[in-house]
Amino acid sequence: FKVATPYSLYVCPEGQNVTLTCRLLGPVDKGHDVTFYKTWYRSSRGEVQTCSERRPIRNLTFQDLHLHHGGHQAANTSHDLAQRHGLESASDHHGNFSITMRNLTLLDSGLYCCLVVEIRHHHSEHRVHGAMELQVQTGKDAPSNCVVYPSSSQDSENITAA
């Protein structure tokens, strides 16, 4: 399987909410012995390997934000910890995997990575990740709503925040 990032760039005004999204593509084994570990973290531009560095999102680590479930299950973080930081990660039955960040500030700007690990018995792993950039803007040049730029082309789409 692969991870697709529908949008490679999110440009949002300060104070807005945004949902960053990844999607599992290809054959996903929904077998009884398979578990998926999914998480989000921040990383740095200019690395030799994108997403190799794992930094916290709003002081929450990859383990604070992870989802862990069987191949046929949906999941979401119900952690009070995450929600206190204005964060929630979620996963549905269709391979969509997201993190919602509320009340954005300039400090939220940066590179975000989603990572999916397919885990089989006995402890074998297959890791895939996706990367996207979030730019939070303030002032007169900031958009009124988040603008997203698809990964495949540079056509932008306006989306209204939740």
């Epitope: 009884h32 012995d33 578990t35 570990y37 390997q49 190799s52 794992r54 990859f62 383990q63 992870h66 862990h68 069987g70 690990v117 885990i119 018995h121 006995h122 402890h123 792993e125 890791r127």
Partner: antibody, heavy 120, light 111 residues
Framework: QVQLQESGPGLVKPSQTLSLTCTVT?????????WHWIRQPPGKGLEWIGD???????NYNPSLKSRVTISRDTSKNQFSLKLSSVTAADTAVYYC?????????????WGQGTTVTVSS | DIVLTQSPATLSLSPGERATLSCRAS??????????MNWYQQKPGQAPRLLIY???NLESGIPARFSGSGSGRDFTLTISSLEPEDFATYYC?????????FGGGTKLEIK
């Protein structure tokens, strides 16, 4: 809150079979990763015995493989250890534990341990 | 099997001092940029308690005075300023390869 509790006889005679059960509360043994048995002889270090996966498949330490069986009862949310042909060297505190993943595999929840003495 | 050698076997220090515990593996425990090395604390009559996973990640609820570092074959657990409750035995454990193995332990005692 996940809790594990070992139970079983505290005294086993040499050549007999040691049988222990781990009861899990607060988490389904079919929903997690792997469920393990670990032991610690008196005054010594820790030794991994083996585990059972959420699917029911098992994996054992080669040093004990010929004598070990790990099984489960999903209706009771329990998993069990059987160790045959025991000797005094099998005297130890036996722990059950859950593993978890976070770019390493680790034991995040342990039972409090149960002491098993092999003696006639 | 991967053999983990911990040193020193016993470490005598006073509260407030810095403790440095070492664990050396007989082969690398790294995979895809991560180290499959964990640290546990055990007190007499109690089960081990996870402190550090993946060589450097602090388990939830563990005080920040505990930290882990290292990669490949050499790993270190550091306690920046010892508290009375830190005197215990510490074990490293690898999970890169079956069978999972533990080090022989380092006993941290009050000087």
């Amino acid at each position: 809150q996940v809790q594990l509790q070992e139970s079983g006889p505290g005294l086993v005679k040499p050549s007999q079979t040691l049988s222990l059960t781990c009861t899990v509360t607060g988490y389904s043994i079919t929903g997690g990763y792997n469920w393990h048995w670990i032991r610690q002889p008196p005054g010594k270090g820790l030794e991994w015995i083996g585990d059972i996966h959420k699917s029911g498949s098992t994996n054992y330490n080669p040093s004990l493989k010929s004598r070990v069986t790990i099984s489960r009862d999903t209706s009771k949310n329990q998993f069990s250890l059987k160790l045959s042909s025991v000797t005094a060297a099998d005297t130890a505190v036996y722990y059950c534990a859950r593993d978890y993943y976070g770019f390493s595999w680790y034991f995040d929840v342990w039972g409090q341990g149960t002491t098993v003495t092999v003696s006639s | 099997d991967i053999v983990l050698t911990q040193s020193p076997a016993t470490l005598s220090l006073s509260p407030g001092e810095r403790a440095t515990l070492s664990c050396r593996a007989s082969q690398s425990v790294d995979y895809d940029g991560d180290s499959y090395m964990n640290w546990y604390q055990q007190k007499p009559g109690q089960a081990p308690r996870l402190l550090i996973y993946g060589a450097s990640n602090l388990e939830s609820g563990i005080p920040a005075r505990f930290s882990g570092s290292g990669s490949g074959r050499d790993f270190t657990l550091t306690i920046s300023s010892l508290e009375p409750e830190d005197f215990a035995t510490y074990y490293c454990q690898q999970s890169i390869e079956d069978p999972w193995t533990f080090g022989g332990g380092t006993k941290l005692e009050i000087k």
